[in-house]
Every structure is written in structure tokens, then in C-alpha cells.
């Protein structure tokens, strides 16, 4: 579902959300570094209900919850969190 | 237009049994989360319950899971509430709330509310 | 339970004026508050969601402000049609939980 938001600097996301998603909600998140053609950071929440969200990497609730998950890092995760590059 | 219509209130007894049901309509059922909150008289809102679409998660108020009941029927677009062993501190105005997980994620629509009263 | 403590429980204010709201809430929700109006004899209505999104239809001069453990909600200029109880509710977690309501009149 989501190659249909490929542009042509290859980014993923061309609509970004700010609004907090309660964990229970979350299948899992993936988060895409810069580079790879897309120039910016892409955050791709996975839903529950097979919805994919694109979350604005400065929204506060995000990186909040990524301090979280930081600090949580060395325990199982409840959020599986999926950093990886596009191919 | 989305509407949420609860029914099923009314006068019970203590220790005895009431099942609520919430009728919705304007909204596609089976894609929401549906919660229940109540209020008694002069009082503000508690959450009871809530369920999600395929009735695989469902969440109570501690206080309120060994009594309470949360059940929905996706074919019908109805939710329900099964009550036991009432007290009066049940004794409340019950609504059902659909539970947006697309947008706003939390209780965007509610219906109008059905009075239970719990006395002797 | 995530305790939310709402003050003030009332108050009074007069048409025009600036009306503010606190929750504050026993643990970190992170921006996951939402508030409600509630009139006699109707059900809530969601007015904040997301700690400071206005929810469709809702006009602009309410608003709402905060993260973590402190909120705010305001209404910027009183309206008669304001009159009601205004309630904050975390849904960061379960079990779902909400302040006490402050209830607002017209001076």
C-alpha cells in the first residue's frame, strides 16, 4: 500500500500527521532515516485497524514516545519499532 | 448523519440484571472501537468499557469487569452492555460512544444516553 | 488508574471574558487528552482532542494547550451558549479516565 506514495525523490510520505495515536492502536512503527533519494526523516505508523499513518517527525507526542522506547530499549519493546532504509 | 441510540434502561433491583443496547447507524460499524461511559445523577464521567471491531480486545474499569459485559454485533450495528448483580451505585445514565481510530482517537461520537436506576 | 484533578470545579465568568481550565494528571499521558462539553440533559461533546486539536466544528476560541502532566483548556472570549460542564479525559491508556468537570456560569 504504501509504494503508492513514492514520489520521485523517493520519499514515502506525502502527508504527515501530528496527532497522538494511543499505543493500543499501533501495530508497530517504522522509521525511515534521510537519504535513499527521500531528503527528510519519515515516521510510518502501522495500525491496528490496517491503517498506515505518516507522523510529522517533530510532533512532540512522537518524540516523546521515542524517548520512551529509548529508554525502554534493553527490555521487549511493546511498540515494535522497524528502523531500516528502503532498498 | 451518525446516531447512536442506546435502549434497554430502566428500574432493576439489586443484584438483579439489565442488558443495554446501542443501535448505531450513519456510521460503518464494524470499522470502530465502541466504548461505554456513564454518569450518575449529579456526577461526572466514567468510562466502563470498550471493544474493538472484531470483539478480540476488550477493555473494563477494574472496578467494573467482574460484573460488567461488553459485547457488540457487527451484522446487527449493535453494541451491548450486560449488567449483573446491580448495586445502586449503578445507578447512572449509560452512554455508548463510537471510538474514532483513524483520526481524533478518542470518543468522537455518543449517543443520548439510557437511565438505569438500581433501587429497592 | 492515570487520576486526572480538574480545577477549578467551578466558576464564574461573564460574557466576553477569558475562561481557563487545568488538568493535572498523575502520570505522563503524553499528549493523549482530550475535552469535552457537556450540557444538561444532552451527552459530552468532544471539543480538544490530542491535547490541542480542535475537533470539527468547534469554534476557535476554544483551545487547548499542554503535554505530559499539565493541561490547559481555554475558551478566549465567553459566549452565553458556552454555559456547561467542561471535562478533560486521558486516552493515553486504559482503563480511560476522566477529570472531575468544571462547571461554568455566567456572572
Known amino acids: 500500500v504504501l509504494e503508492v506514495y513514492y514520489t520521485s525523490l523517493r520519499c514515502r510520505c506525502v502527508q504527515e500527521s501530528s496527532v497522538f495515536i494511543p499505543r493500543r492502536f499501533i501495530d508497530r512503527i517504522q522509521i525511515l532515516p534521510r537519504g535513499n533519494g527521500c531528503p527528510r526523516k519519515e515516521i510510518i505508523v502501522w495500525k491496528k485497524n490496517k491503517s498506515i499513518v505518516c507522523v510529522d517527525p517533530q510532533a512532540e507526542w512522537i518524540q516523546r514516545m521515542m524517548e520512551v522506547l529509548r529508554k525502554r530499549s534493553s527490555s521487549t519493546l511493546p511498540v515494535p519499532v522497524f528502523k531500516r532504509k528502503i532498498p | 448523519e451518525v446516531q447512536l441510540v442506546e435502549s434497554g434502561g430502566g428500574l432493576v433491583q439489586p443484584g438483579g440484571s439489565l442488558r443495554l443496547s446501542c443501535a448505531a447507524s450513519g456510521i460503518d460499524f464494524s470499522r470502530y472501537w465502541m466504548s461505554w461511559v456513564r454518569q450518575a445523577p449529579g456526577k461526572g464521567l466514567e468510562w466502563v468499557a470498550e471493544i474493538n471491531p472484531e470483539s478480540s480486545t476488550i477493555n473494563y474499569a477494574p472496578s467494573l469487569k467482574d460484573r460488567f459485559t461488553i459485547s457488540r454485533d457487527n451484522a446487527k450495528n449493535s453494541l451491548y452492555l450486560q449488567m449483573n448483580s446491580l448495586r445502586a451505585e449503578d445507578t447512572a445514565v449509560y452512554y455508548c460512544?463510537?471510538?474514532?481510530?483513524?483520526?481524533?482517537?478518542?470518543?468522537?461520537?455518543w449517543g443520548q444516553g439510557t437511565t438505569v436506576t438500581v433501587s429497592s | 488508574d492515570i487520576q486526572m484533578t480538574q480545577s477549578p470545579s467551578s466558576l464564574s465568568a461573564s460574557v466576553g471574558d477569558r475562561v481557563t481550565i487545568t488538568c493535572k494528571v498523575s502520570q505522563d499521558v503524553n499528549t493523549g487528552v482530550a475535552w469535552y462539553q457537556q450540557k444538561p440533559g444532552k451527552a459530552p461533546k468532544l471539543l480538544i482532542y490530542s491535547a490541542s486539536y480542535r475537533y470539527t466544528g468547534v469554534p476557535s476560541r476554544f483551545s487547548g494547550s499542554g503535554s505530559g502532566t499539565d493541561f490547559t483548556f481555554t475558551i478566549s472570549s465567553l459566549q452565553p451558549e458556552d454555559i456547561a460542564t467542561y471535562y478533560c479525559?486521558?486516552?493515553?491508556?486504559?482503563?480511560?479516565?476522566f477529570g472531575g468537570g468544571t462547571k461554568l456560569e455566567i456572572k
Open positions: 479525559q486521558q486516552y493515553y491508556s486504559t482503563p480511560l479516565t
Open positions: 460512544a463510537r471510538q474514532d481510530d483513524y483520526e481524533t482517537y478518542t470518543m468522537d461520537y
